[in-house]
């Protein structure tokens, strides 16, 4: 194999290659700005297609962003030393299309990761443990930022996009210490059922802007530590008992249910039970119907039962098309 | 047109160094990555070594990390290789070649190559 | 290292026959998004030249006799009508990881 000035011989990419001389642990790479003072390299909008070779072994702070790096293979930022001090790392908007399994080895303080902005059409089912072992060493990962990294329609894989998602997310049990996950605007229809079970170090979970029609699959029980739910911006029609009790049970939760296009007939009505006396749900006094047409723009805590009704099931003799 | 010119190549003793150049013409040169590969004589193609346009990655072949150093000086439109501590088994057609990244790029333009040859 | 092994090492030709060269890697060049698989000539006394990139896309100003294909660790090149001006040797080069390398290249002669 080639070898690389600062790379571990455990990662093909750069355990494979790198630099002629070790890096001097203070250098800048070229088209990056360094502080050694703030520990903070930024190598923003530079149209880089990989990633620098030669960052400063104090890097505490690595911002990527802006450019067109469209591959992290396995050990990206693998370094011989190795980059002990890196905990926060944004890639976004650097038009990466394929993360590969064990990206972000051999990084042992990465705390958040943002791969936001991203039209990641293949991440693979490793990306965030590192390894295919069932159950592989914790990451480290504490924030993990994935806004929009959903690809255009035209890159999209036969495979559902969510069920890659909930694959790299529940790989190995890795991700048992995250705290935070950011999820929004993926165009997830659904959220995959086992997911969150593996998550429950959770304290905030962001799900907006997304395309989810109902939670029924989705438990929520074990997250016991979560205080921000955020679902603004979907196609929740409804929440049933089920999801009702798993929210009320959660000690320390805020729900953001804003702007979803709630369904106002029969099958509301425990759900509007629930928001007159719940303190889980943040602003629900801005929650209006959306359907019916005659009930569009009415308040949900202002419904009482004689308002959510239901038209009967014609039989089919006397349906009309 | 694109234009890729090697120089530089000669006969050396083993132990020995050399500095090959390419010059770059047709193209804008600091958007590409560049790259050095080999050919030893009657053999196949070797890579021996990749900059990226900045100059902020670098990649070298296990065969001559340590020894070999790319580098490029995009005011000039010239990319190089210093070649240290040379061995016979360095003795090849060196050519330099362009890409539009490492791992999705392609050598798309070839230098005709310069000859270095190692020998006591 | 990623290997990868052409076959046949040299074929031999008639004007206007079909050719077809093998490469397969040692492990997969290919993911969901990209393959990492490219096709060079290097005709006597030339350097190289791109023939087909990512297993299947046809260089500009390359005659669409040639053609590529294949996923993961088998690819085949193909011409479809051989002329005496394709002599020379072709190599297959992967990009899935560092270090790229090369198969060990095909000869293709006229009959």
């Known amino acids: 194999t080639s070898s690389a000035s600062s790379s571990s011989s455990s990662a093909p990419f750069l355990a494979s290659a790198a630099s002629a001389q070790p890096p001097l642990p203070d250098q800048c790479p070229a088209l990056c700005e360094c502080s050694e003072a703030a520990r903070t390299v930024k190598c923003v909008n530079r149209n880089l297609t990989e990633v620098p070779t030669d960052l400063p072994l104090y890097v505490r702070n690595l911002f990527l962003t802006g450019n067109q790096l469209a591959v992290l293979p396995a050990g990206a930022f693998a370094r011989r030393p190795p980059l002990a001090e890196l905990a926060a790392l944004n890639l976004s908007g650097s038009r990466l299309d394929e993360v590969r399994g064990g990206a972000f080895e051999h990084l042992p303080s990465l705390r958040q990761l943002d791969l936001s902005h991203n039209p990641l059409a293949y991440l693979s089912p490793f990306a965030f443990s590192g390894s295919n072992a069932s159950i592989s060493a914790p990451s480290p990962l504490v924030e993990l930022i994935l806004n929009h990294i959903v690809p255009p329609d035209d890159k999209r894989q036969n495979r559902s996009f969510e069920g890659m998602v909930a694959a790299a997310l529940v790989a190995g049990r890795a991700l048992q210490g995250l705290h935070l996950l950011e999820l929004a605007s993926n165009h997830f229809l659904y959220l995959p059922r086992d997911v969150l079970a593996q998550l429950p170090s959770l304290r905030y979970l962001d799900l907006s802007n997304n395309s989810l029609v109902s939670l029924t699959y989705v438990s929520f029980r074990n997250l016991t530590h979560l205080e921000s739910l955020h679902l603004e911006d979907n196609a929740l029609k409804v929440l049933h008992n089920g999801t009702l009790a798993e929210l009320q049970g959660l000690p320390h939760v805020r729900v953001f249910l804003d702007n979803n296009p709630w369904v106002c007939d029969c099958h509301m009505a425990d759900m509007v039970t629930w928001l007159k006396q719940t303190g889980v749900v943040q602003g629900k006094d801005r929650l209006t119907c959306a359907f019916p047409e005659k009930m569009r723009n009415r308040v949900l805590l202002e419904l009482n039962s004689a308002d959510l009704d239901c038209d009967p099931i014609l039989p089919p003799s006397l349906q009309t098309s | 047109e694109v234009q890729l010119v090697e120089s530089g190549g000669g006969v050396v003793q083993p132990g020995r160094s050399l500095r090959l150049s390419c010059a770059a013409s047709?193209?804008?040169?600091?958007?590409?990555?560049m790259h050095w590969v080999r050919q030893a004589p009657g053999k196949g193609l070797e890579w021996v070594a990749y900059i990226s346009s900045g100059s902020t990655s670098f990649y070298y072949a296990d065969t001559v990390k340590g020894r070999f150093t790319i580098s490029r000086d995009n005011s000039k439109n010239t990319l190089y290789l210093q070649m240290n501590s040379l061995r016979a088994e360095d003795t090849a057609v060196y050519y330099c070649?362009?890409?539009?990244?490492?791992?999705?790029?392609?050598?798309?333009?070839w230098g005709q190559g310069t000859t270095v040859t190692v020998s006591s | 290292d990623i290997v990868l092994t052409q076959t046949p090492l040299s074929l031999s030709v008639t004007p206007g026959q079909p050719a077809s060269i093998s490469c397969r890697a040692s492990?997969?060049?290919?993911?969901?998004?990209?393959?990492?698989l490219h096709w060079y000539l290097q005709k006597p006394g030339q350097p190289p030249q791109l023939l087909i990139k990512s297993a299947s896309n046809l260089e500009s100003g390359v005659p669409d006799r040639f053609s590529g294909s294949g996923s993961g660790t088998d690819f085949t090149l193909k011409i479809s009508r051989v002329e005496a001006e394709d002599v020379g040797v072709y190599y297959c080069q992967h990009s899935w990881e560092i270090p790229l390398t090369f198969g060990q290249g095909t000869k293709l002669e006229i009959k």
């Open positions: 492990q997969s060049v290919s993911s969901s998004s990209y393959t990492y």
């Open positions: 047709g193209f804008t040169f600091s958007n590409f990555g």
């Open positions: 070649a362009r890409t539009n990244s490492l791992l999705r790029g392609f050598f798309d333009a």
